[in-house]
C-alpha cells in the first residue's frame, strides 16, 4: 500500500530524505523539486544543496536537519492545499546515471473546523473570505530571512503521519535513505 505524508493547512510539512556521506563533510549535491523526479535534475526546484551548503531555496522551504550529516529532509512552512502533490528528493551522486531519486507524496488536509459534520472540500462554506480558492490562493511572499526559529520538536510531525501505513516510530526509517561510499 502506498506511503504518503500528511500535514494540515497552516502547519509545517516534513518530507524525510537521507543519505550517509562517505566521509564527514564529503557532501553530495541534493535537489528538491515539485512533481515527480525527471530523468535528470529536479523539476520546479524549490531547494538545492552543493558540496558545501544550501545554495538555492525558495520561500517556505528549508532543511531543518543537519544536512552535513546527510539529513536532507524538507520542511515546508505553513502549508496550503496547493502544496499537495509529489515531491522529488534527488541525491546527485557523481557518475553517469548514479543519482538516487525518491518520489514522496504529500497530502494536505483542511484545518479542523468545528463543528464539521462532513469533510470540508468546497471552501466557500467553511471559509467565506477564501471564496473558492481551495488552497490555490496567491503565492506567499515571505522571505526566508523573516521565518521564525523553529526546531524539530515544534514541527508537527504527528500531522505528517504515514498515510495508509504504520506511523513510523523513527522518521529516519520511514524516509528515503541511502548510503554512499
Amino acid at each position: 500500500s502506498e506511503v504518503e505524508y500528511r500535514a494540515e493547512v497552516g502547519q509545517n510539512a516534513y518530507l524525510p530524505c537521507f543519505y550517509t556521506p562517505a566521509a564527514p563533510g564529503n557532501l553530495v549535491p541534493v535537489c528538491w523539486g515539485k512533481g515527480a523526479c525527471p530523468v535528470f535534475e529536479c523539476g520546479n526546484v524549490v531547494l538545492r544543496t552543493d558540496e558545501r551548503d544550501v545554495n538555492y531555496w525558495t520561500s517556505r522551504y528549508w532543511l531543518n536537519g543537519d544536512f552535513r550529516k546527510g539529513d536532507v529532509s524538507l520542511t515546508i512552512e505553513n502549508v496550503t492545499l496547493a502544496d499537495s502533490g509529489i515531491y522529488c528528493c534527488r541525491i546527485q551522486i557523481p557518475g553517469i546515471m548514479n543519482d538516487e531519486k525518491f518520489n514522496l507524496k504529500l497530502v494536505i488536509k483542511p484545518a479542523k473546523v468545528t463543528p464539521a459534520p462532513t469533510r470540508q472540500r468546497d471552501f466557500t462554506a467553511a471559509f467565506p473570505r477564501m471564496l473558492t480558492t481551495r488552497g490555490h490562493g496567491p503565492a506567499e511572499t515571505q522571505t526566508l530571512g523573516s521565518l521564525p526559529d523553529i526546531n524539530l520538536t515544534q514541527i508537527s510531525t504527528l500531522a505528517n503521519e504515514l498515510r495508509d501505513s504504520r506511523l513510523a516510530n523513527d522518521l529516519r526509517d520511514s524516509g528515503a535513505t541511502i548510503r554512499i561510499g
Epitope: S1, A82, I108, K109, P117, R119, R134, R163
Partner: antibody, heavy 119, light 107 residues
Framework: EVQLVLSGAEVVKPGASVKMSCKAS????????MHWMRQKPGQRLEWIGY????????KYNEKIKGKATLTSDKSSSTAYMELSSLRSEDSAVYYC????????????WGQGTTVTVSS | DIVMTQSPSSMSTSVGDRVTITCKAS??????VAWYQQKPGKSPKLLIY???NRYIGVPDRFTGSGSGTDFTFTISSVQPEDIAVYYC?????????FGGGTNLEIK
C-alpha cells in the same frame, strides 16, 4: 497498488434504474473521497459528484442533481452509484476515480462501465 | 461553473514533432489545472497537476505551464504511443470541469 474495479456493462430500458459498484483496494478506503464521472460518446468528461466513505458526506454536480445517488460500504471498500429514470441521453461510460487527497485531480480511475439506455 | 475551452480539437502530427495544446479557463484558476491522456477504450491517465507538476511515471517529454486563465500542454517529441485524446481539467473549485479534448493523430 491502488485499484478501482467497476462492475460490468449495463443495457437498460428508458425509465429504468441501474446501480453500479466500484471496489477499491490498495489503500484505506475511508481516507479518500470517491468521485464519479461520466463521458457521453464523443463528449468531454463530466463530474457527477463524490462521496466521503468516512462520514457519508456527499456532494453532487448541481447540473445533474437527482440523476445519481451515491452510497458506500466501508466493510467491502465499495462505492456505489445508482442512476434513476434513465433516458437515452444518459448513455455513457461511467467512471469512479480517487483524488490525491483533498485536491480534485485524479491519479486513480476505474476502468469505466458502459451504460446503454435503449428500448 | 468554470468553463475550460481547449484548442485545437484535433491535430495531426509526425513522430518527433513538438506539439502544443492550449486551454483557457473562463475565470482565474491560479495554477489549478491538470492534464490527462485518454486512449480509446481506456480510462484517463493523469499526466500533469497544478499546471506544471508531472505525476509519477510520466515521461519528461510531457510538460505543462501557465497560470490564471491560460494554460499550455506540450509534448516535446511525439512518440507513436502518444496517440490519444488529451484533456485539461480545472481543480480550483467544485465542480471540477474538463476541456473538450484534443485528439492527437499521427500523419
Amino acid at each position: 497498488e491502488v485499484q478501482l474495479v467497476l462492475s460490468g456493462a449495463e443495457v437498460v430500458k428508458p425509465g429504468a434504474s441501474v446501480k453500479m459498484s466500484c471496489k477499491a483496494s490498495g489503500y484505506t478506503f475511508t481516507n479518500y473521497v470517491m468521485h464519479w464521472m461520466r463521458q457521453k460518446p464523443g463528449q468531454r468528461l463530466e463530474w457527477i459528484g463524490y462521496i466521503d466513505p468516512d462520514n457519508d458526506g456527499i456532494k453532487y454536480n448541481e447540473k445533474i442533481k437527482g440523476k445519481a445517488t451515491l452510497t458506500s460500504d466501508k466493510s467491502s471498500s465499495t462505492a456505489y452509484m445508482e442512476l434513476s429514470s434513465l433516458r437515452s441521453e444518459d448513455s455513457a461510460v461511467y467512471y469512479c476515480a480517487r483524488d490525491f487527497g483533498y485536491v480534485d485531480w485524479f491519479p486513480y480511475w476505474g476502468q469505466g462501465t458502459t451504460v446503454t439506455v435503449s428500448s | 461553473d468554470i468553463v475550460m475551452t481547449q484548442s485545437p480539437s484535433s491535430m495531426s502530427t509526425s513522430v518527433g514533432d513538438r506539439v502544443t495544446i492550449t486551454c483557457k479557463a473562463s475565470q482565474d484558476v491560479t495554477t489549478a489545472v491538470a492534464w490527462y491522456q485518454q486512449k480509446p477504450g481506456k480510462s484517463p491517465k493523469l499526466l500533469i497537476y497544478s499546471a506544471s507538476n508531472r505525476y509519477i511515471g510520466v515521461p519528461d517529454r510531457f510538460t505543462g505551464s501557465g497560470s490564471g486563465t491560460d494554460f499550455t500542454f506540450t509534448i516535446s517529441s511525439v512518440q507513436p504511443e502518444d496517440i490519444a485524446v488529451y484533456y485539461c481539467q480545472q481543480h480550483y473549485s467544485i465542480p471540477p470541469t474538463f476541456g473538450g479534448g484534443t485528439n492527437l493523430e499521427i500523419k
